[in-house]
Amino acid sequence: SGPVKELVGSVGGAVTFPLKSKVKQVDSIVWTFNTTPLVTIQPEGGTIIVTQNRNRERVDFPDGGYSLKLSKLKKNDSGIYYVGIYSSSLQQPSTQEYVLHVYEHLSKPKVTMGLQSNKNGTCVTNLTCCMEHGEEDVIYTWKALGQAANESHNGSILPISWRWGESDMTFICVARNPVSRNFSSPILARKLCEGAADDPDSSMV
C-alpha cells in the first residue's frame, strides 16, 4: 500500500487512477468512491461489475490493465477513491488511496473598479479580478503592459497609480486553476481614468 496519490481532472475530461500489481492470482479488485462501491472486477472470472449503471459508460481499463480510467468527469466526482486487491496469496488486501480534484475550465474573469480619485493629475484606483461563478482554487495575477518594463502583480486586487501625460498602460488579469487559465479583456489606463479627468479631486465607483 503506497502513499495517497493526488489526481487532478477537468470537467468533461478524463482521469486515470494508476494501479499495478504483480500478484499472480488476483481474486477481485474493488474500487470505491467516498466509501460507495464503484467497480468490482474478477480477473479470473472475466467479470467487471459497475455498481451504478450510469457510470458504466464512464469506466474503462486502458490496455486491459488494472488502472481505472474515469471519463466525462463532473465536479461531484471530486473526492476519495480507494482500491483493494484481494488475493488468496496475500495475507491482507493490497490497497491504494487516491484523492481526485475536478476543476472547471475557467471562463473569462470579470474586472471591477474600486473608488477612483484624481489628485494632482494622478489617477489612483484599484482593479479587482474575480470569477463570476465562484470557481475554486483560482490564482490571480495581473500583467501591466506599456511601461519600459512590463510588470506582474500577484493577487486579485491591482492598485493603480497613473499620471496623465504618461504613456498609456494596459492591464490584463490572468486567472488560473490547475487545469486551465483565462484572461480578462484588456483595460486601458487612459479610458479607466477618463471619467475623473474633468474634476481633479473627484471620486467615482
Partner: antibody, heavy 120, light 108 residues
Framework: QVQLVQSGAEVKKPGASVKVSCKAS????????MNWVRQAPGQCLEWIGR????????KYNGKFKGKATLTADKSTSTAYMELSSLRSEDTAVYYC?????????????WGQGTLVTVSS | DIQMTQSPSSLSASVGDRVTITCKAS??????VAWYQQKPGKAPKLLIY???YRYTGVPDRFTGSGSGTDFTLTISSLQPEDFATYYC??????????FGCGTKVEIK
Amino acid sequence: QVQLVQSGAEVKKPGASVKVSCKASGYAFSSSWMNWVRQAPGQCLEWIGRIYPGDGDTKYNGKFKGKATLTADKSTSTAYMELSSLRSEDTAVYYCARSTMIATGAMDYWGQGTLVTVSS
Amino acid sequence: DIQMTQSPSSLSASVGDRVTITCKASQDVSTAVAWYQQKPGKAPKLLIYSASYRYTGVPDRFTGSGSGTDFTLTISSLQPEDFATYYCQQHYSTPPYTFGCGTKVEIK
C-alpha cells in the same frame, strides 16, 4: 511497445515432435499469463493452454494434455510450446497470445503465428 | 466444456451498414465474453472483453453487449477495413476457454 515474435514454419513427419517459440518484449513477461491457441484449416480457434512465466504454473485444455507441453524462460522472455506424437490433424497455425490483466482469459497481443505442417 | 455458437457463419453487407453478430453460450458465462477480428493471414485482434469493454484503440463503432448466455457484437456503420472474420470467445472462470467458429463479413 508490446511484441510477440514466433519462430518460423515447421514441416514434421507423423510421430515427431516440434517446439515453437514465442519471444516477448515491451512488457513484464514474468507477470502476465501467456496462452497458446491453434487454428487448423477450416476449423474453429482452439485454446491449448496457458503458462505463468513467473513460476511456471500451467493450465491446459484437457484435449491437449499429453499433446502440448508449455514452458517459459524468464531470462530470455521466451515462451515455448512443444507438441509431441504429431499427427496430420495437428497441422495448423499456432499462436501465442498474452492475457490482459483485467480479464485473464481475454488475449490482447498475439504472435504472428507459426504454421506447423505434419506430412509423411 | 462450454460451447459457443456463433451466427450467422457469414454475411454480406455494404459500407455504412449496421451489422450484428450473435453468440450463444451453452451455459451461463456471466459477462465473460471477448470478441476478436481476424483478417486473412493475420493473427486475431482483440476488440471487446468482458462483454462490453472496448479494448484501447478500438473504434467506437464496435459495441459489445449481453450477459448470461446471449451476446452481441454490433458494428454501427461498417467501414472498408471492417471486412474480416469475427470470433467470440468465453473467458469465464476456470479454463478451457472456447471460441465460436467465426462470422465472415463480406462485401455485398
